[in-house]
C-alpha cells in the first residue's frame, strides 16, 4: 500500500498521528470495528501530552479508548504493552465491577467526565475516538 | 475555599538542606497534579518539578534534578519539597500551584499558594 | 528544552489602550500556552489556557490567541488593575517553561 502523508477530511493530526472523534455513541465492539473498517484503531494514549490532547477534544463525555481486559489482562489494541506503559486511572480502578446487573465484571476502558479512566461494560453505548499513524502503509492501493 | 499555604522557608547555609511543604484545602487534593515553581528577587518565574495526583511519576528542572525532591501525602493532603545541597542560585520564592487538569497529564497552574521565601546564604 | 521569548520586555500604555504581547516558542507547541497576570509581592494568577480559552472569573478585555510557534496575549482596553508583568507558560514537554514576562507600565 501507499503511505498516507496527511490526515482524512474530518480527521485531526497531532505529533504524525491522526484522530476522529464520534458524536454518537457505539459499544465498545462496534466502536472497535469502526476505527478498523477506517483503517485504524480505537485510541491508544502513550503519554501525558496525548491524554490531554484528546482529553481536550472529547470534553466531559465518557469516550472508549483502545484498552480492554476481555480476554484476561489488560491490552492495548496496537500491541502496545500494558504493563510499562502510560496509565491515568481514576481512583480503585480498574474494578471489573460486577455490581451493574448486565452480567459479567468490566473488560473495556473509557475516558470519564474529568479525563481519566474507568473499566465499564463494554456494551454501553459511548462516545470513540480512533487513531491512525501517518506515514504507515495504507490498504488503498497505490495510484498507478 | 480552594487554597493552597506554603511553609518551611527561610535561611539556610550553602550544602544545607530544607523541607517545604504546601497544605491544600477546598479540593480533591489527590485528584490533581501538583508542581512546585520558584521566583529569584526581581526575576521571572521558573518551574521545579511536578508529580501526578497518585504519586506515580515525578519530573524536575534540570537545576534542581537530584537535589530535590517531590512527594505528597494524600492522606494530610500535603505537598512536599525536600531540598539538599542548597546552593545561593536556589535564594528564591517557592510557590505550590495546581494543575489545572486531573489525573496524569498537565497543563496550566490554576491555584497557587502565596509563596514562601527561601534564602540560602553563608 | 523549549524556549519561550517574549516580546516585548516592557510596554507603557494608557488605561483605554489596547495592549498585544507576543511569545514564540523556540518549537511548536500546538496549542499548549498559558498566560499569567502575576502584581508585586504576589503569586502569578491564570489568565489563559490551551493559548485561547479564558480561566473562569477573568474579564473578557483578555484574549489569547495563536498555536505552533506564535502566540499573542491582548487586553482589548487596558484597564488599571492590569498594571502588572505578564508570563507565558508552554505545557508541552519538560521542563515547562516560561517566557522572560512583560511588564505593563502606566503612561
Known amino acids: 500500500g501507499s503511505e498516507r502523508t496527511c490526515c482524512p477530511v474530518n480527521w485531526v493530526e497531532h505529533e504524525r498521528s491522526c484522530y476522529w472523534f464520534s458524536r454518537s455513541g457505539k459499544a465498545w465492539a462496534d466502536a472497535d470495528n469502526y476505527c478498523r473498517l477506517e483503517d485504524a484503531h480505537l485510541v491508544v494514549v502513550t503519554s501525558w501530552e496525548e491524554q490531554k490532547f484528546v482529553q481536550h477534544h472529547i470534553g466531559p463525555v465518557n469516550t472508549w479508548m483502545g484498552l480492554h481486559d476481555q480476554n484476561g489482562p489488560w491490552k492495548w489494541v496496537d500491541g502496545t504493552d500494558y504493563e510499562t506503559g502510560f496509565k491515568n486511572w481514576r481512583p480503585e480502578q480498574p474494578d471489573d465491577w460486577y455490581g451493574h446487573g448486565l452480567g459479567g465484571g468490566e473488560d473495556c476502558a473509557h475516558f470519564t467526565d474529568d479525563g481519566r479512566w474507568n473499566d465499564d461494560v463494554c456494551q454501553r453505548p459511548y462516545r470513540w475516538v480512533c487513531e491512525t499513524e501517518l506515514d504507515k502503509a495504507s490498504q488503498e492501493p497505490p495510484l498507478l | 475555599q480552594v487554597q493552597l499555604v506554603e511553609s518551611g522557608g527561610g535561611v539556610v547555609q550553602p550544602g544545607r538542606s530544607l523541607r517545604l511543604s504546601c497544605a491544600a484545602s477546598?479540593?480533591?487534593?489527590?485528584?490533581?497534579?501538583m508542581h512546585w515553581v520558584r521566583q529569584a528577587p526581581g526575576k521571572g518565574l521558573e518551574w521545579v518539578a511536578v508529580i501526578w495526583y497518585d504519586g506515580s511519576d515525578k519530573y524536575y528542572a534540570d537545576s534542581v534534578k537530584g537535589r530535590f525532591t517531590i512527594s505528597r501525602d494524600n492522606s494530610k493532603n500535603t505537598l512536599y519539597l525536600q531540598m539538599n545541597s542548597l546552593r545561593a542560585e536556589d535564594t528564591a520564592v517557592y510557590y505550590c500551584?495546581?494543575?489545572?487538569?486531573?489525573?496524569?497529564?498537565?497543563?496550566?497552574?490554576?491555584?497557587w499558594g502565596q509563596g514562601t521565601m527561601v534564602t540560602v546564604s553563608s | 528544552d523549549i524556549q519561550m521569548t517574549q516580546s516585548p520586555s516592557s510596554v507603557s500604555a494608557s488605561v483605554g489602550d489596547r495592549v498585544i504581547i507576543t511569545c514564540r516558542a523556540s518549537?511548536?507547541?500546538?496549542?499548549?500556552l498559558a498566560w499569567y497576570q502575576q502584581k508585586p509581592g504576589k503569586a502569578p494568577k491564570l489568565l489563559i489556557y490551551a493559548a485561547s480559552s479564558l480561566q473562569s472569573g477573568v474579564p473578557l478585555r483578555f484574549s489569547g490567541s495563536g498555536s505552533g510557534t506564535d502566540f499573542t496575549l491582548t487586553i482589548s482596553s487596558l484597564q488599571p488593575e492590569d498594571f502588572a508583568t505578564y508570563y507565558c507558560q508552554q505545557a508541552k514537554s519538560f521542563p515547562l517553561t516560561f517566557g522572560g514576562g512583560t511588564k505593563v507600565e502606566i503612561k
Open positions: 518549537q511548536g507547541i500546538s496549542i499548549w
Open positions: 500551584a495546581r494543575d489545572r487538569l486531573v489525573g496524569a497529564t498537565v497543563d496550566a497552574f490554576d491555584i
Open positions: 477546598g479540593f480533591t487534593f489527590s485528584s490533581y497534579g
